[in-house]
Amino acid sequence: GITNINCSGHIWVEPATIFKMGMNISIYCQAAIKNCQPRKLHFYKNGIKERFQITRINKTTARLWYKNFLEPHASMYCTAECPKHFQETLICGKDISSGYPPDIPDEVTCVIYEYSGNMTCTWNAGKLTYIDTKYVVHVKSLETEEEQQYLTSSYINISTDSLQGGKKYLVWVQAANALGMEESKQLQIHLDDIVIPSAAVISRAETINATVPKTIIYWDSQTTIEKVSCEMRYKATTNQTWNVKEFDTNFTYVQQSEFYLEPNIKYVFQVRCQETGKRYWQPWSSLFFHKTPETVPQVTSKAFQHDTWNSGLTVASISTGHLTSDNRGDIG
């Protein structure tokens, strides 16, 4: 981009240096070079000389016209051909930007991940603006009317210690850039309604060789929330559709969930929880794979294991993967 250059003249853009993408724009260059009546004025975009749509306005000024300008950023500079000068003389340069005004932020969501000490607010920013867009998150107590504002370029983490106006708040988001400003609808929250329990994790699986073989999935969470509802979904890795089991859970001990599965098939499991009756779910846990044996018992440990199988009676393989899938719509 154009940084520090000594100008011998002036370059400007109409309608503005930052403009709406797809507009027709004019770039003007006016020379003010001592002892130089420019024979010709040249325009460069990103270092490449422009050859068309240049109009000489008067002895010192020229105009470059662009129709339907679609580049998000460009560095422009202009030069003059001066008599008795072998090289072109730099007049001035300017960085120009095109983009869009922000959309109205929607789907404003605030959650408190248990133990985080923060309220995390996110929103759908809408279409890409291409230009610097800032967001101001407003948090206003419904009782004290104390309003706090947080400037960010994406989501925001707000310390719950700073929320001193009780438990009931309005939250809304203002989006602003050089081309416009929009404001979201107001979200009314109660701090206790937006807590998401500490992540539930599947630790191991075992298949017990009974008359009808049964697979036990062991899973746990460090949550202190008493009433927690969870869902475990599972499917054969070759399948598209998930089966879902629901549980009312008390995490004072490790959970054991029983499944009657087909033999010699690789399954994938995920779990997620929410405080019973509340709005927001955890994202689905990491993928946990378990292959049911043909006949012999099988134990699998840790989430997202390697595909390591041997001929022994018990197989355990460990990997530290954090792959999650299909998290869309889990919060909201």
Epitope: L142, E143, T144, E145, E146, Q164, G166, H190, D192
Partner: antibody
Framework: EVQLQQSGGGLVKPGGSLKLSCAAS????????MSWVRQTPEKRLEWVAG????????YYPDNVKGRFTISRDNARNTLYLQMSSLRSEDTAMYYC????????????WGQGTTLTVSS | DIQMTQSPKFLLVSAGDRVTITCKAS??????VAWYQQKPGQSPRLLIY???NRYTGVPDRFTGSGYGTDFTFTISTVQAEDLAVYFC?????????FGAGTKLEMK
């Protein structure tokens, strides 16, 4: 010392109107949400109106909505309850109370003022 | 509206007794419950906020507990000056509601 001094109670005929006042002192009135709570002759407590610190957010239960209006004058440190279309069931002792938002509770109460609705 | 069902309505006690009053909310109110004491001819006085927090100056014989829908208020050792009516109140919704009250009387 926090004080809530109430005035304005009395005897009113059914369908009549009355305005209660609550003068606050000893704290920054404009920083606190306020409420009106009444106590029926049977000694039940009923919350009848609430207002946020700046007066932007106002709440009423259904049984008084459209008949009662809570307001405040932060310059005068005073809370008001304008009551109209009064009914016999509005007969009660009315209290103003300060809401301590970070406690989710009413921590200071006025001395109460009596409204009797009777023909 | 959220209903707060308080029980019992009356309690006959002797000095030194342990007293427990319960309040059940018609839906979860988190821990947004307060307990008040009202003596004859006086305004209500805040004792407990956020279900279990003792208000400034309240003796430690008064305790509260609970979360969600079930709440308990306890006086560990009743004294003569504790004879009063006790009310629970939820502040979870924007429309607060009170329990019907429990009257403590001496045997």
């Amino acid at each position: 010392e926090v004080q809530l001094q109430q005035s304005g109670g009395g005897l009113v005929k059914p369908g009549g109107s009355l305005k209660l006042s609550c003068a606050a002192s000893g704290f920054t009135f404009s920083s606190y949400a306020m409420s009106w709570v009444r106590q029926t002759p049977e000694k039940r407590l009923e919350w009848v109106a609430g207002i946020s610190s700046g007066g932007s957010y106002i709440y009423y239960p259904d049984n008084v909505k459209g008949r009662f209006t809570i307001s405040r004058d932060n310059a005068r440190n005073t809370l008001y309850l304008q009551m109209s279309s009064l009914r016999s069931e509005d007969t009660a002792m009315y209290y103003c109370a300060r809401k301590k938002s970070d406690y989710g509770a009413m921590d200071y109460w006025g001395q109460g003022t009596t409204l009797t609705v009777s023909s | 509206d959220i209903q707060m069902t308080q029980s019992p309505k009356f309690l006959l006690v002797s000095a030194g007794d342990r007293v427990t009053i319960t309040c059940k909310a018609s839906q979860s109110v988190s821990n947004d419950v307060a307990w008040y004491q009202q003596k004859p001819g006086q305004s209500p006085r805040l004792l407990i906020y956020y279900a279990s927090n003792r208000y400034t100056g309240v003796p430690d014989r008064f305790t509260g507990s609970g979360y969600g829908t079930d709440f308990t208020f306890t006086i560990s050792t009743v004294q003569a000056e504790d004879l009063a009516v006790y009310f629970c109140q939820q502040d979870y919704s924007s429309l607060p509601t009170f329990g019907a009250g429990t009257k403590l009387e001496m045997k």
